[in-house]
């Protein structure tokens, strides 16, 4: 059996922050998981960890040097991005494992997330030119 | 039997345009077959066509808006995109059709290249103010 | 068929280490948690470590805590243990167990004996 | 840690008797609770998961019951094949802990 993910299509983060709500076709009240958002069709970089279980406050981070924070619903996570850059648009993938109580229990493939980060193109002021940052 | 295909997993359009490539575990040489490019995780848009047979000169369209190219090899189809938009910053799939000689082939699917469009970002001169275009 | 095969046990001195691997067949081992259950001669059964399907939590006895780590390579369908500092009361039959619902399916073990 | 408890930690019996085996978990665990069988030089082999459901291949004279801290196996009636080594264990919660296992031997 696996949980099945349901996730937009595509969101653009126009100030270089995005809100990723990875829904389950499961219930994670009172279970010790590990939600976990992964940048790249081979979802090779692991951007957001949320873990929690049943005795302690929920744990989110990133070894990867991402800005991420993650609010928990019932059958949901959603991970909270800042500071993107540009160039980390990309898919980003929601996995889930479930491992206690069993079964031991993880998630069908999602379609994936393109986060589209427009981020914020600044221009020289009138008064004094200088280069433009891309 | 399908056709394996190789795409690029990330591409950047930094001036609207781009060059992807589509590599098939299969030998197009006087073939007919209908090579295509779709856009988005449920590749609901055909970006655009290459069909080629032996008898008649390579056939490039688009029907949704696109304009592109097409180039042929032995065991490829690269479709050349310009005049991109930010916001057709997406995922792609490369799709082949081969329809004589039989068997008729087609592909499994590809993981797809994110085409991120990076466009111009366009200043205005400090003699002449007037709003930046995002 | 599920088949789960270990190696790597063998005699080591007190304080050396060894790497025990479990292959596994018959099953798509990146969608399973996997365990390692040892059993000192004679004893009962005492679990030992536990991985996720992706390798991305791991549980351990608080009895080899710091000293053993459990890790996977999806890719070679293979899991393994890594113990280090090993003492005398490590000696054991070492069995890598696929866990779903239960410890479902078990390899045959390995012998580990800690001696000098 | 939940320590589970096994009870008796030996018992010699006739082919054909009625077999039970109890376990005691420390704190509850719902239903999170399975069996194994356990024969000299062999690996252990799952026989109850979830308290009270038969694996797979797994004659139906062994049987499972219970929830929370109190579990039960029972041997309807005991085989020949049956003499052998019985744990519990639980997975509701980590770590995942064993009986100290029930010895069924020969009368």
């Known amino acids: 059996n696996k949980i099945l993910v349901k996730q937009s299509p595509m969101l653009v983060a126009y100030d270089n922050a995005v809100n990723l709500s990875c829904k389950y076709s499961y219930n994670l009240f009172s279970r010790e998981f590990r939600a976990s958002l992964h940048k790249g069709l081979d979802s090779a970089v692991e951007v957001c960890v949320v873990y929690g279980n049943y005795s302690q406050q929920l744990q989110v981070y990133s070894k990867t040097g991402f800005n991420c924070d993650g609010k928990l619903g019932n059958e949901s996570v959603t991970f909270y991005l800042q500071n993107l850059y540009v160039n980390q648009t990309d898919i980003y993938f929601c996995k889930i494992e479930v491992m206690y109580p069993p079964p031991y229990l993880d998630n069908e493939k999602s379609n994936g997330t393109i986060i589209h980060v427009k981020g914020k193109h600044l221009c020289p002021s009138p008064l004094f030119p200088g280069p433009s940052k891309p | 039997n399908k056709i394996l295909v190789k795409q690029s997993p990330m591409l950047v359009a930094y001036d609207n345009a781009v060059n992807l490539s589509c590599k098939y575990s299969y030998n197009l040489f006087s073939r007919e077959f209908r090579a295509s490019l779709h856009k988005g995780l449920d590749s609901a848009v055909e970006v655009c066509v290459v069909y080629g047979n032996y008898s008649q000169q390579l056939q490039v369209y688009s029907k949704t808006g696109f304009n592109c190219d097409g180039k042929l090899g032995n065991e490829s189809v690269t479709f050349y995109l310009q005049n991109l938009y930010v916001n057709q910053t997406d995922i792609y799939f490369c799709k082949i059709e081969v329809m004589y000689p039989p068997p008729y082939l087609d592909n499994e699917k590809s993981n797809g290249t994110i085409i991120h469009v990076k466009g111009k970002h366009l200043c205005p001169s400090p003699l002449f103010p007037g709003p930046s275009k995002p | 068929e599920v088949q789960l095969l270990e190696s790597g046990g063998g005699l080591v001195q007190p304080g050396g280490s060894l790497r025990l691997s479990c292959a596994a067949s018959?099953?798509?081992?990146?969608?399973?948690?996997m365990s390692w259950v040892r059993q000192a001669p004679g004893k009962g059964l005492e679990w030992v470590s536990a991985i996720s399907g992706s390798g991305g939590s791991t549980y351990y006895a608080d009895s080899v805590k710091g000293r053993f780590t459990i890790s996977r390579d999806n890719s070679k369908n293979t899991l393994y243990l890594q113990m280090n500092s090993l003492r005398a009361e490590d000696t054991a039959v070492y069995y890598c167990?696929?866990?779903?619902?239960?410890?479902?399916?078990w390899g045959q073990g390995t012998l580990v004996t800690v001696s000098s | 840690d939940i320590q589970m408890t096994q009870s008796p930690s030996s018992l010699s019996a006739s082919v054909g008797d009625r077999v039970t085996i109890t376990c005691r978990a420390s704190?509850?665990?719902?239903?999170?609770l399975n069996w194994y069988q356990q024969k000299p030089g062999k690996a252990p082999k799952l026989l109850i998961y979830a308290a009270s459901s038969l694996q797979s291949g797994v004659p139906s004279r062994f049987s499972g019951s219970g929830s929370g801290t109190d579990f039960t196996l029972t041997i309807s009636s005991l085989q020949p094949e049956d003499f052998a080594t019985y744990y519990c264990?639980?997975?509701?919660?980590?770590?995942?802990?064993f009986g100290q296992g029930t010895k069924v031997e020969i009368k």
């Open positions: 018959g099953f798509t081992f990146s969608s399973y948690a």
């Open positions: 704190q509850s665990i719902s239903s999170y």
């Open positions: 264990q639980q997975g509701g919660m980590p770590p995942d802990t």
């Open positions: 167990a696929k866990r779903y619902i239960a410890f479902d399916y």
